[in-house]
Interface confidence: medium
Amino acid sequence: MMTGTIETTGNISAEKGGSIILQCHLSSTTAQVTQVNWEQQDQLLAICNADLGWHISPSFKDRVAPGPGLGLTLQSLTVNDTGEYFCIYHTYPDGTYTGRIFLEVLESSVAEHGARFQIP
């Protein structure tokens, strides 16, 4: 039975040209995290494997930095980076947990972070 929940940074915004940390946290389970995938709508951004470390998708090598922790730092933001991001936690023995973050990249200098929220 899957008892865990994914807590994410929720709806967030950031300035064009800046950077943002995408962060998820798995709680309420003792399952072992074997791998975390970071995806953007229809593309893979990066993978963090418990044994092998980080794989950054070649398309994003120049703009994505691993961490902090299992999170991901997205740099040199453009308006095209606006959209949904997913953290996919592969765990044993529970299976797969998915969290969602919505990022809005703003032209203006006003970029406020949204509230945290949970996805069961």
Epitope: E39, D51, L52, H55, K61
Partner: antibody
Framework: QLQLQESGPGLVKPSETLSLTCTVS??????????WGWIRQPPGKGLEWIGY???????YYNPSLKSRVTISVDTSKNQFSLKLSSVTAADTAVYYC??????????WGQGTLVTVSS | EIVLTQSPGTLSLSPGERATLSCRAS???????LAWYQQKPGQAPRLLIY???SRATGIPDRFSGSGSGTDFTLTISRLEPEDFAVYYC????????FGQGTKLEIK
């Protein structure tokens, strides 16, 4: 355990397009655990990576073949495919499909020989 | 592009002996990104070692991998008749490349 099976014509004429399909069983091609790749091996020679696709559709190709390669995925059929255009005799090889964890290739098809000849 | 050079090209040994196969990279490779495969005639390659030193599922413990940076080694501690095959190293940097292979043959 994953099983992969290549299928497609064994003979292709020069300048035409080579088309192969890989059918995955024992697991879902929509798993975010895997990349789905193609590797080839000319007779008596070593291995050359062609490219891979992620289930969401993003692809990455060997730069030396990029202009001629297209890899696509059909999640409804649990298959992925390779198209290699403008083939020459140098493209004659055993073509393998394989699953990749992003670092290495853990499950392989048995391979299919494709000969380019008129 | 990272070029992998394997040596020797052919290694002739007898069952029961120890085999040491070398793989040298043209530039430094993260240990996480180095794997070894075994290929027998008419068969697909089989993953033996990943992450430079971790054995894949079902691989006997007579196979071991070691190394870091530019120099990696596959060791078969005591050769069995079924171990005679071609061995390839493979790395993942920004793209995958394979070594040219080492043929392990019966002396």
């Amino acid at each position: 355990q994953l099983q992969l099976q290549e299928s497609g014509p064994g003979l292709v004429k020069p300048s035409e397009t080579l088309s192969l399909t890989c059918t995955v069983s024992g697991g879902s091609i929509s798993s975010s655990r895997y990349f789905w790749g193609w590797i080839r091996q000319p007779p008596g020679k070593g291995l050359e990576w062609i490219g891979y696709i992620y289930y969401r559709g993003s692809t990455y190709y060997n730069p030396s073949l990029k202009s001629r390669v297209t890899i696509s995925v059909d999640t409804s059929k649990n298959q992925f495919s390779l198209k290699l255009s403008s083939v020459t005799a140098a493209d004659t090889a055993v073509y393998y499909c394989a699953s990749s964890s992003a670092w290495y290739f853990d499950y392989w098809g048995q391979g299919t020989l494709v000969t380019v000849s008129s | 592009e990272i070029v992998l050079t394997q040596s020797p090209g052919t290694l002739s040994l007898s069952p029961g002996e120890r085999a040491t196969l070398s793989c040298r990279a043209s530039q430094s490779v993260s240990s996480s990104y180095l794997a070894w495969y075994q290929q027998k005639p008419g068969q697909a390659p089989r993953l033996l070692i990943y992450g430079a030193s971790s054995r894949a599922t079902g691989i006997p413990d007579r196979f071991s991998g070691s190394g870091s940076g530019t120099d990696f080694t596959l060791t078969i501690s005591r050769l069995e008749p079924e171990d005679f095959a071609v061995y390839y190293c493979q790395q993942y940097g920004s793209l995958y490349t394979f070594g040219q292979g080492t043929k392990l043959e019966i002396k």
